[in-house]
Interface confidence: medium
């Protein structure tokens, strides 16, 4: 059976697969997924290994029409470095010389300057090029190699291993060499995989059942450290509770060097955030941190300085802390918009069982704003999801130059933010450089400001506008309002009408359904339309909703189903990557973000059309 990293190299023109007959003969044969000799896998960014021989594809020289055969894998050799060129060409790195079928006289696979059909290769059984099953570095734990990546294949007691092994061990722990020759270099580490006893790599907090892994002997960049945690179904550490910080202070007290945690300001337009999307509500900075120096976007915990936090350049090499298990956040269920009949008094706007109102004109200090909201039967608004924030931005009449009090504050416990309405903090969205909590002036209250409505801490004594929120009064079944210019069941936003397609459909089926309604799969033109759509679908239980974006027509170039330019994107992390397909919006914790899915997957969808009676604005000129 093929493991997920292995593949057969397939030439569509001949309908045959590459077959390593021997180290000196790499030919083709009828494709057979059970044949070890036809299985290959990437073992570094640029090396392809034969699974049967544990040797790498290479050439004797970078010249036209030389045989491609198998060599002992050597990560430094220029003659074993391959790269995917446009579409399905595979070439020797840095040259216009391609992996080629050979010809009638030449049975062996050859290196050739021609880029025709005989130089085009796919993963057998897919339409993908060979790089779509690329190499993922595996960062080691413990051992003596400072967390370096596994080197596959590696030699141990004169035997080659292409995977982690428990050879030499009686306890079943899986390890790998971090250079190709363990026997000579003696460098190794344990693999970030599940094996008997791997739980002892973690410390479980008995109070919360959350587990932590302290990798103090590693030396990785922030991004490498994060990858290592993710390889163990974990994330870099987030700290949202004082108890959690206390536990970790104890756990790291014998150490001296800094350890990466998940806090970062890597998002271009927002502020400090945890990589696991926990809310940034508890602050434990070292005095003088966070420093505003550009590039210092990642955060380390300093065991030698009472486990306080310091921002550093992300390329520094440090140890790190991973976290897995129950999140420390209280479980707090936000009702889906469709679950709650929402009836609001005049001038209040309904959303998901609550009513909202912006007070823009009567500026008040935070304490007085809170009093006013409470007199009206509510509180300063709490915000628990990206959908709720996007509802406020897109539908409450929020303006880009607004600066409005919300209920978040750290008045009660310094550096520990809470909502004034007592609901748990499950979500934060800080502006770039925030929360700054400048020491020379108390910034204990929080405002929403700027075009995106992100947050900043502020001195509570500033007179500003504010947003109130209250529980709605349920008044029997809700009357479905027909919005002006839209048919029944469609929702209006600006010039358009939108409808959720409730039948699970492939991308093509969804597109057809929209067309049948004289509409099309939704396009998303800007941040504000995205905000509306996020609030429209984000709290629903289904995982995905199709948009009209795909790269069906031209692989690698994403286009809308209607002739409209792609001027805005909202990709989820690691998207779109190299995956071809169709684009759907996520719900839940990644609400609104775009993922590339296989077009024949089934999902719900959003249709869109011009509202009736709306004058079409002129198309923007480029």
């Amino acid at each position: 059976l093929l493991d997920t990293r292995q593949f057969l190299i397939y030439n569509e023109d001949h309908k045959r697969c590459v077959d390593a007959v021997s180290p000196s003969a790499v030919q083709t044969a009828a494709c057979n997924q059970d044949a070890e000799s036809q299985k290959f896998r990437w073992v570094s960014e640029s090396q392809i290994m034969s699974v049967a021989f544990k040797l790498c594809l290479g050439v004797p020289s970078k010249t036209d029409w030389v045989a491609i055969t198998l060599y002992a894998c050597d990560s430094k050799s220029e003659f074993q470095k391959w790269e995917c060129k446009n579409d399905t060409l595979l070439g020797i790195k840095g040259e216009d010389l391609f992996f080629n079928y050979g010809n009638r006289q030449e049975k062996n696979i050859m290196l050739y300057k021609g880029s025709g059909l005989w130089s085009r290769w796919k993963i057998y059984g897919t339409t993908d090029n060979l790089c779509s099953r690329g190499y993922e570095a595996m960062y080691t734990l413990l051992g003596n190699a400072n967390g370096a990546t596994c080197a596959f294949p590696f030699k141990f007691e004169n035997k080659w291993y292409a995977d982690c092994t428990s050879a030499g061990r009686s306890d079943g722990w899986l390890w790998c060499g971090t250079t190709t020759d363990y026997d000579t270099d003696k460098l190794f580490g344990y693999c970030p995989l599940k094996f008997e006893g791997s739980e002892s790599l973690w410390n479980k907090d008995p109070l919360t059942s959350v587990s932590y892994q302290i990798n103090s002997k590693s030396a990785l960049t922030w991004h490498q450290a994060r990858k290592s945690c993710q390889q163990q179904n974990a994330e870099l550490l987030s700290i949202t509770e004082i108890h959690e910080q206390t536990y970790l202070t104890g756990l790291t007290s014998s150490l001296t060097s800094g350890l990466w945690i998940g806090l970062n300001s890597l998002s271009f337009n927002s502020g400090w955030q945890w990589s696991d999307r926990s809310p940034f509500r508890y602050l434990n900075w070292l005095p003088g941190s966070p420093s505003a120096e550009p590039g210092k976007s990642c955060v380390s915990l300093n065991p030698g300085k009472n486990a306080k936090w310091e921002n550093l350049e992300c390329v520094q090499k440090l140890g790190y802390i991973c976290k897995k298990g129950n999140t420390t956040l209280n479980s707090f269920v936000i009702p889906s918009e469709s679950d709650v009949p929402t009836h609001c008094p005049s001038q209040w706007w309904p959303y998901a069982g609550h009513c909202y109102k912006i007070h823009r004109d009567e500026k008040k200090i935070q304490r007085d704003a809170l009093t006013t909201c409470r007199k009206e039967g509510g509180d300063l608004t709490s915000i628990h999801t990206i959908e709720e924030l996007d509802f406020i931005i897109s539908q409450l009449g929020y303006e880009p130059n607004d600066e409005l009090w919300i209920g978040l504050n750290d008045i009660k416990i310094q550096m520990y933010f809470e909502w004034s309405d007592g609901t748990p903090v499950t979500f934060t969205k800080w502006l770039r450089g925030e929360p700054s909590h400048e020491n020379n002036r108390q910034e204990d209250c929080v405002v929403m400001k700027g075009k995106d409505g992100y947050w900043a801490d502020r001195g509570c004594e500033w007179p500003l506008g504010y947003i109130c929120k209250m529980k709605s009064r349920s008044q029997g079944p809700e009357i479905v309002e027909v919005e002006k210019g839209c048919r029944k069941g469609w929702k209006k936003h600006h010039f358009y009408c939108y409808m959720i397609g409730h039948t699970l459909s492939t991308f093509a089926e969804a597109n057809q359904t929209c067309n049948n309604e004289n509409a099309y799969l939704t396009t998303i033109e800007d941040r504000y339309e995205q905000a509306f759509l996020t609030s429209f679908v984000g709290l629903r239980p289904e995982k995905y909703f199709w948009t009209g974006l795909s790269d069906i027509q031209t692989k690698g170039t994403f286009q809308w189903t209607i002739e409209e330019e792609v001027r805005f994107t909202h990709w989820n992390s690691d998207m779109p990557g190299r995956k071809p397909g169709c684009v759907a919006m996520r719900t839940g914790i990644a609400g609104g973000l775009w993922d590339v899915l296989k077009c024949d997957e089934k999902a719900k969808f959003v249709c869109k059309h011009w509202a009736e009676g709306v004058t079409h604005p002129p198309k923007p000129t480029t």
Epitope: F156, G168, R169, S170, D171, W173, S200
Partner: nanobody, 118 residues
Framework: DVQLVESGGGLVQPGGSLRLSCAAS????????MGWYRQAPGKQREEVAA???????NYADSVKGRFTISRDNAKNTVYLQMNSLKPEDTAVYYC????????????WGQGTLVTVSS
Amino acid sequence: DVQLVESGGGLVQPGGSLRLSCAASGSIFTINAMGWYRQAPGKQREEVAAITSGGSTNYADSVKGRFTISRDNAKNTVYLQMNSLKPEDTAVYYCKAVVVTTPYSDYWGQGTLVTVSS
């Protein structure tokens, strides 16, 4: 490296008790688990009991309910309390440490002889 020294063996009557000790020195912070094994004359070495760094224990069926393995982290020592001894418990008892600092996990002591005879 890890060095292991066993003590506490000797001659005991059937039904009697003995307590074996195994003291570890060297890179002891790297020990993941410790165990006791025994080898009777002309037989294969077999596992008797083991204890992990987290305190989980495991026993061979033949000694369950009679033998108890424990550890004293402060003294870097593992013990085997042997009660209700039988003649078939006669063997050389070896201490083993499983370490994580090299791929070669097992370090052994020299062994201590236990003889159960009337």
